[in-house]
């Protein structure tokens, strides 16, 4: 097991998850750790505890390894980091990778007020409701680099979007969470259409998908859930 020393001088590895950092309960996920060609061992940590290791075969001469989680559960959802060893030296820690398990317990209802098709500049609010009590709700938009909004609530949360722009168009889902990394089943999708403005036409996503495997998003974890912070939470963490 890796020992913290002043010798940790190797550059930090890159960590990412495939097919997604959001994994349905019971499904598998691959965590990749990319270090150096010369790495003799990679170690994966989960919530600060040693989780797994891999010693690459010299014949393969690869600078990355894959850690396979065969069945994602609430016990394997959380923060992962990885390290690698080359010679006597250990690398710095990778950036944290946050894995979320979805498909737990219940399915929320999502609806939009006043309606799913609105005029440019109109005020829009999303509502998410879950019968079983939860601590926090998340609203996600499919595709693109989009912020997650979150709101604390018992069985319902509202997400005011303000006056909508074309950037708001797209397909949304919501989740209830039992902690930050254990989420409910996703709601049915709600597609927000924007009409009016220069291009007087209904604008829907060019490539809609209901698969969470293709979502990319930011994570906003402020108390109100209305402001957005800059913490980027994507498939790959490497800064």
């Amino acid at each position: 097991q890796r020992i913290n020393t002043e010798k940790e001088t190797l550059p930090k590895p890159i960590i990412w998850a495939k097919p997604s950092i959001m994994v349905t309960n019971g499904n598998s996920v691959n965590i990749w750790c990319q270090g150096a060609q010369s790495a003799s061992e990679y170690q994966l940590y989960f919530e600060g505890s040693f989780f797994a290791l891999e010693r690459p075969k010299p014949s393969r001469s690869m600078n990355k390894v894959r850690f396979f989680i065969s069945q994602m559960t609430s016990h394997t959802a959380g923060i992962y980091t990885c390290f690698y060893q080359s010679g006597e030296l250990w690398s710095k820690s990778s950036n944290p990778l946050k894995l979320v398990v979805t498909g737990l317990y219940d399915t929320p209802n999502l609806w939009v007020y006043p309606r799913p098709e609105v005029t440019l500049g109109e005020n829009v609010t999303f509502f998410c409701q879950l019968k079983t009590a939860t601590s926090k709700f998340f609203l996600l938009k499919e595709r693109g680099s989009n912020h997650i909004q979150n709101k604390y609530g018992n069985i319902q949360a509202e997400f005011p979007m303000g006056p909508v722009t074309r950037a708001h168009r797209g397909t949304y889902r919501c989740f209830g969470s039992y902690n930050d990394y254990a989420w409910s089943f996703p709601s049915e999708p709600v597609t927000l259409l924007i009409t009016g403005g220069v291009e007087n036409s209904s604008l829907a996503p060019t490539d809609p998908t209901s698969s969470l495997d293709y979502w990319e998003f930011d994570l906003s974890t402020n108390e109100s859930g209305l402001q957005k912070d800059s913490a980027f939470w994507d498939h790959t963490t490497q800064n």
Partner: nanobody
Framework: EVQLVESGGGEVQPGGSLRLSCAAS????????MGWFRQAPGKEREFVAA???????YYAESVKGRFTISRDNAKNTLYLQMSSLRAEDTAVYYC????????????????????WGQGTLVTVKP
């Protein structure tokens, strides 16, 4: 569905040896990563040793040099050879599997394992 059945536990004197076996049902054994964990009375379950599907191994510091993990894919069986046993090795020993797995992964954390045996008791006392 994988079933794991441990055997070989018993009472032994300090300095003695035991070999634990874990028989796995099904045809997935060769593609599984395997591990041994133990739980002493009043304590949390702890990692002992693990082996990848390509026979790479890893040991807890407390057993390194005394315990040896191995597998026989033809017999669908995992082994733990324990020698120089100490009183602090007294525990229920559990066999666990990650099915399926990939490459040379060795799993140390109990959360990684998706199949568990019922355990076999090892008692070390004079």
């Amino acid at each position: 569905e994988v079933q794991l059945v441990e055997s070989g536990g018993g009472e032994v004197q300090p300095g003695g040896s035991l070999r634990l076996s874990c028989a796995a049902s099904g045809r997935t054994f060769a593609s599984a990563a395997m591990g041994w964990f133990r739980q002493a009375p009043g304590k949390e379950r702890e990692f002992v040793a693990a082996i990848s599907r390509s026979d790479d191994t890893y040991y807890a510091e407390s057993v390194k040099g005394r315990f040896t993990i191995s597998r026989d894919n033809a017999k669908n069986t995992l082994y733990l050879q324990m020698s120089s046993l100490r009183a602090e090795d007294t525990a229920v020993y559990y066999c666990a599997a990650v099915v399926p797995t990939y490459g040379n992964n060795i799993y140390v954390h109990s959360a990684a394992y998706n199949y568990w045996g019922q355990g076999t008791l090892v008692t070390v006392k004079p």
